[in-house]
């Protein structure tokens, strides 16, 4: 699987999940999030050569097309597969609120 | 929506579905498909600027991060959203078989 266990331990040029730390205040200009101060959002990048981790029948066909026709510009793209939530603490006035934001952390990637 | 109705009628540089006709014999080397001879598989391509058809909270956050930090290399990617099946006719020996292949035709795209 193109997941953090594999991708963070290997120098992989092709489609893989990459570490990306986002500081809410510095990177997004968000003052409203009290905790955490930031988090590893991660992201997916890298080419999708030769039928790598194809997601659907279309990406299989497109990968095959691209493999057999290397001059073609139509190739699958490396995007998130498994995502996990992030729990944040913020305030509405003086009232603390705990919110679980879905699909915030990329754990693995696929070629789609 | 970044679908064929919009994308095929407009010169859109950003993420959109693009027409791609695949000839089974010439492009894939498939002799086994009797009908059709090929089909419009289409594909997704184009940049994903901030908030363009963002797919998840992560792609929204990543799009914002990319907008505020233009030097960053982490940006969402344009990939299929809605896919449709394709019905094919082939033979097993002399017996004709009709098969509906799922997720073969891209109808719209998203930034993921």
């Amino acid at each position: 699987a193109l997941d953090t266990n594999y991708c963070f331990r290997n120098l992989e040029e092709n489609c893989c999940v990459r570490p990306l730390y986002i500081d809410f205040r510095q990177d997004l200009g968000w003052k409203w999030v009290h905790e955490p101060k930031g988090y590893y959002a991660n992201f997916c990048s890298g080419p999708c050569p030769y039928l790598r981790s194809a997601d659907t029948t279309h990406s299989t066909v497109l990968g095959l097309y691209n493999t057999l026709n290397p001059e073609a510009s139509a190739s699958p793209c490396c995007v998130p597969q498994d995502l996990e939530p992030l729990t944040i603490l913020y305030y509405v006035g003086r009232t603390p609120k705990v919110e679980q934001l879905s699909n915030m952390v990329v754990k693995s990637c696929k070629c789609s | 929506a970044l679908d064929t109705n919009y994308c095929f009628r407009n010169l859109e540089e950003n993420c959109c579905v693009r027409p791609l006709y695949i000839d089974f014999r010439q492009d894939l080397g498939w002799k086994w498909v009797h009908e059709p001879k090929g089909y419009y598989a289409n594909f997704c391509s184009g940049p994903c600027p901030y908030l363009r058809s963002a797919d998840t909270t992560h792609s929204t956050v990543l799009g914002l991060y990319n907008t505020l930090n233009p030097e960053a290399s982490a940006s969402p990617c344009c990939v299929p959203q809605d896919l449709e099946p394709l019905t094919i006719l082939y033979y097993v020996g002399r017996t004709p078989k009709v098969e509906q292949l799922s997720n073969m035709v891209v109808k719209s795209c998203k930034c993921s």
Epitope: T60 | V92, L101
Partner: nanobody, 114 residues
Framework: QVQLVESGGGLVQPGGSLRLSCAAS????????MGWFRQAPGKQREMVAI??????SYVDSVKGRFTISRDNAKNTLALQMNSLKPEDTAVYFC?????????WGPGTQVTVSS
């Protein structure tokens, strides 16, 4: 259901040759492609060569050294590997994609070492 079994792996010296074979059994129809993939320790599985009815493709690192061939009548796939290098060491897997579904063999070990 499709079953695949590879054979022909082994230990060979650099510059040597091996021929891998893959026997497919079951109901073989609607083949998108058949191919050889390999996986070195700690690495992702990667394509080596694929074959459709009348097209073939090779990963750059094996072009001119490896040749893939299919015998549809016997439902077999072969990979002739010449001028082998230590970096070709891996487990080699036969793969058949039928109507979009992947089937894999258990793999055969190829070790290139002096």
């Amino acid at each position: 259901q499709v079953q695949l079994v590879e054979s022909g792996g082994g230990l060979v010296q650099p510059g040597g040759s091996l021929r891998l074979s893959c026997a497919a059994s079951g109901s073989i129809f609607g083949v998108f492609y058949m191919g050889w993939f390999r996986q070195a320790p700690g690495k992702q599985r990667e394509m080596v060569a694929i074959s459709t009815d009348d097209r073939t493709s090779y990963v750059d690192s094996v072009k001119g050294r490896f040749t893939i061939s299919r015998d549809n009548a016997k439902n077999t796939l072969a990979l002739q590997m010449n001028s082998l290098k230590p970096e070709d060491t891996a487990v080699y897997f036969c793969n058949l994609n039928q109507l979009g579904t992947d089937y894999w063999g258990p793999g055969t070990q190829v070790t290139v070492s002096s």
